[in-house]
């Protein structure tokens, strides 16, 4: 059962700027008199189905009105999602004998964009290089998790990584930042050798990766950094 009783709302993820459908299921074999959709307890739309002609749809919330649509089964479709669409939605299906309530919680998540790494590195006289790397994405919120990996091992569970690299005992080493939320992930790799190579003191550049529309395009090399984008 896709739609839920009011006690346990169905949690639905929407992506900022895209569309989402809140699925509605009808009571089997019963004639529906009307359907009311509510957003945060405020009326959104009132629908009167007809057997022989198109349903009457009264949109009662002008704010979301232009972005509202309904499927043949009166599921709610919301397009061009905004952060303020986050919240509680309810559909009440009224029949001759009963009223069925379906509840939803809509969460709007951002597609992650523009992953970048800032580097502050220091090369010591003993030839070891201390890397201080900071990873960020545009408009990050608490739902974005960051981690740093090298050779499949997690080196950090936060946007920052501090690591020492010794070219005499380590072969070329890539450090990869992975930023992830429920709807997308981005990764960006930097080379220790290129960051530390041949300079006594580095105040490194900022490396930026631009999202690749087609993930199959693979790597986008940007100086000493390269990145992946997944949806």
């Amino acid at each position: 059962d896709a739609s839920q009783s009011s006690l346990t709302p169905l949690m639905v993820n929407g992506i900022l700027g895209e569309s989402v459908t809140l699925p509605l299921e009808f009571p089997a074999g019963e004639k529906v008199n009307f359907i009311t959709w509510l957003f945060n307890e405020t009326s959104l739309a009132f629908i009167v189905p007809h057997e022989t002609k198109s349903p009457e749809i009264h949109v009662t919330n002008p704010k979301q009105g232009k972005r509202l649509n309904f499927t043949q089964s009166y599921s709610l479709q919301l397009s061009n999602l905004k952060m303020e669409d986050t919240g509680s939605y309810r559909a009440q299906i009224s029949t001759k004998t009963s009223a069925k309530l379906s509840s939803y919680t809509l969460r709007i998540l951002r597609q992650l964009r523009n992953i970048q790494v800032t580097n502050h590195s220091q090369l010591f006289q003993n030839m070891t290089c201390e890397l201080h790397l900071t990873c960020s994405v545009e408009d990050a919120d608490d739902n974005v998790s960051f981690r740093w990996e090298a050779l499949g091992n997690t080196l950090s569970s936060q946007p920052n990584l501090t690591v020492s690299w010794d070219p005499r005992i380590s072969s070329e080493q890539d450090y990869t930042c992975i930023a992830e939320n429920a709807v997308s992930n981005l990764s960006f790799s930097v080379s220790a050798q290129k960051l530390c190579g041949g300079r006594s003191s580095l105040e490194g550049p900022r490396f930026e990766g631009k999202p690749i529309p087609n993930p199959l395009l693979g790597l986008d090399s940007t100086r000493t950094g390269h990145h992946h984008h997944h949806h």
């Epitope: 950090s156 569970s157 936060q158 946007p159 920052n160």
Partner: antibody, heavy 118, light 108 residues
């Protein structure tokens, strides 16, 4: 090996303040965030939030905003949980847990039992 | 928040019996972010199965994990006395991070 050692059990009066410590060893402290988790018979395991051990920035779950404070002593590789204005319902076991990559609670402290009673 | 519903709440099993504990999520979860913890009485929880199906170090091969979307499970191929514990599922992709209420496994 990785170890998280917490301070011992505590008995406090309502209205008082308690500070629980979590001493980390066996890994680079500033590379892995530290979670705090509350466990009580009534509510089970509840994530309280975490602190970024690199820059000290805390993130609190909604239920734990205001009365609770996370802090660090980086040089001592120690994280702290402070609970102010103690209430009876704060009676619980509190755990620190090292954040992993996709695993949020890879290593746990042994827990600190806090009893709030007059 | 994402609610994780575990069932059963308590279960008594005989040695050698096959056990399945389920964890149902109120929102779909990427399999990389669903984990299981074991907690024995008087001890802290311990990471047991991570990323839905990977056994943590030292976990016996009689344990397995599976699932996707909103439905996940932990299975013990043949129950042993040392498996008596509480088992918790946990999701790590939505804030706040949440745990299931736990399944207490006892020996018959």
């Amino acid at each position: 090996q990785i170890q998280l050692v917490q301070s011992g059990p505590d008995l406090k009066n309502p209205g008082k303040t308690v500070k629980i410590s979590c001493k980390a060893s066996g890994y680079t402290f500033t590379n892995f965030g530290m979670n705090w988790v509350k466990q009580s018979p009534e509510r089970g395991l509840k994530w309280m939030g975490w602190i970024n051990t690199y820059n000290g920035k805390p993130t609190y779950a909604d239920d734990f905003k205001g009365q609770f404070a996370f802090s660090l002593e980086t040089s001592a590789t120690t994280a702290y949980l402070q609970i102010n204005n103690l209430k009876n319902e704060d009676t619980a076991a509190y755990f620190c847990a090292k954040r992993g990559g996709t695993v949020d609670f890879g290593y746990w402290g042994q827990g600190t039992t806090l009893t709030v009673s007059s | 928040e994402v609610v994780l519903t575990q069932s059963p709440t308590t279960m008594a099993a005989s040695p050698g019996e096959k056990i399945t504990v389920t964890c149902s999520a109120s929102s779909p979860i990427s399999s990389n972010f669903l984990h299981w913890y074991q907690q024995k009485p008087g001890f802290s929880p311990k990471l047991f199965i991570y990323r839905t199906s990977i056994l943590a170090s030292g976990v016996p091969a009689r344990f397995s994990g599976s699932g996707s979307g909103t439905s996940f499970s932990l299975t013990i191929g043949a129950m042993e006395a040392e498996d008596v514990a509480a088992y918790y599922c946990q999701q790590g992709i939505y804030m706040p991070l949440t745990f299931g209420a736990g399944t207490k496994l006892e020996l018959k």
